[in-house]
């Protein structure tokens, strides 16, 4: 008799999830010599232990603590780049500006980026059919709790000037319900962070509006100022040129506004 299985509203675990996590870990430790001591099998065991045999709506930050310990890493606290709804450009930027880090440039972020996972209560099976959706099913699911945990700790680690890349093409350039708006903003440490600098990325080539005056940016400024952190904002009118100028800052066209 086939065993009844809970149907969740979200997509199931990414196919070949264990192999993907293990392969990413090996690749990361090869690319980053300072992490070559990491035992990727132990990392996978700790990752698996966070959600296997547990109800996928009852995951806690504590479940991920063994994985957090194994992912210990040096991140220059004044070189942190946060992002919201514009991940690809943020990652393109840190691939060029190698001394800056997004969360996905760390081992833990790299392991989990774009993956979905969940298990089932009381069985050692990974659920490849469906996983809980944050809105429709539950917020304390394995993926959401993981990103909330690492995002909070990443924000807590930041110091001096913290940068955030925001998508100027969205109706809400700053969204209070995003991971940045709901977790990272509130976990920046005012005693360590002097300034949050927002980079608002424009979408249209002819878009010359000052999106730093957008009501949602003003809302972000208000939240940050109330936390005794200074706020500044820059328009990035030409993201393609912006990246090109990061690559070749001596280019004569890079002295003008981008």
């Amino acid at each position: 008799v086939p065993r009844w299985r809970q149907q969740w509203s979200g997509p199931g675990t990414t196919k070949r999830f264990p192999e993907t996590v293990l392969a990413r870990c090996v690749k990361y430790t090869e690319i980053h010599p300072e992490m070559r001591h990491v035992d990727c099998q132990s990392v996978w065991d700790a990752f698996k232990g966070a959600f296997i045999s547990k109800h996928p709506c009852n995951i806690t930050e504590e479940d991920y603590q063994p994985l957090m310990k194994l992912g210990t890493q040096t991140v220059p606290c004044n070189k942190i780049l946060l992002w919201s709804r514009i991940k690809d450009l943020a990652h393109q930027f840190t691939q060029v500006q190698r001394d800056m880090f997004t969360l996905e440039d760390t081992l833990l972020g790299y392991l989990a980026d774009d993956l979905t996972w969940c298990g089932e209560f009381n069985t050692s099976k990974i659920n490849y059919q469906s996983c809980p959706d944050w809105r429709k099913d539950c917020s304390n699911n394995p993926v959401s709790v993981f990103w909330k945990t690492v995002s909070r700790r990443f924000a807590e680690a930041a110091c001096d000037v913290v940068h955030v890349m925001l998508n100027g093409s969205r109706s809400k350039i700053f969204d209070k319900n995003s991971t940045f708006g709901s977790v990272e903003v509130h976990n920046l440490q005012p005693e360590k962070v002097q300034t949050l600098e927002a980079w608002v990325i424009h979408g249209g080539r002819e878009d010359s509006r000052d999106l730093c005056q957008d009501p949602t940016i003003k809302e972000l400024e208000s939240i940050i100022s109330k936390r005794n952190i200074q706020f500044s904002c820059k328009n990035i009118y030409r993201p393609d040129k912006f990246l090109q100028c990061v690559k070749n800052p001596e280019d004569s066209s890079c002295t003008s506004e981008i």
Partner: nanobody, 117 residues
């Protein structure tokens, strides 16, 4: 600005003890969880232990559990690590850092602990 100064390291025989101290300044010490991390020669960073601001919550790496004790004195802005039953594999530079990790940017020079007979 967060500043820390670690001290108390030295050369000790296997089975011996040391007490590390970390004097912190530039922030409200009692509000911050603190950690000890270490880096063995030619190895990466390893988290050792963490303690909450009030000292109500404490955690240890499996490799040091039962041998090391973390504590803090908020009136002196100082973090401690009592290390007993030291082993050769505990040889490392020990750093204190704010937060519980996994992301650290340690501000001090660290203190070298060498365990050798």
């Amino acid at each position: 600005e967060v500043q820390v100064l670690e001290s108390g390291g030295g050369l000790v025989q296997p089975g011996g003890s040391l007490r590390l101290s970390c004097a912190a300044s530039g922030f409200t010490f009692s509000r911050f969880a603190m950690s000890w991390v270490r880096q063995a020669p030619g190895k990466g960073l390893e988290w050792v232990s963490a303690i909450s601001g009030s000292a109500g919550s404490i955690d240890y790496a499996d490799s040091v559990k039962g041998r090391f004790t973390i504590s803090r004195d908020n009136s002196k802005n100082t973090l401690y690590l009592q290390m007993n039953s030291l082993r050769v594999e505990d040889t490392a530079v020990y750093y204190c850092a704010d937060g519980t990790g996994p992301f650290f940017d340690y501000r001090g020079q660290g203190t070298l602990v060498t365990v050798s007979s």
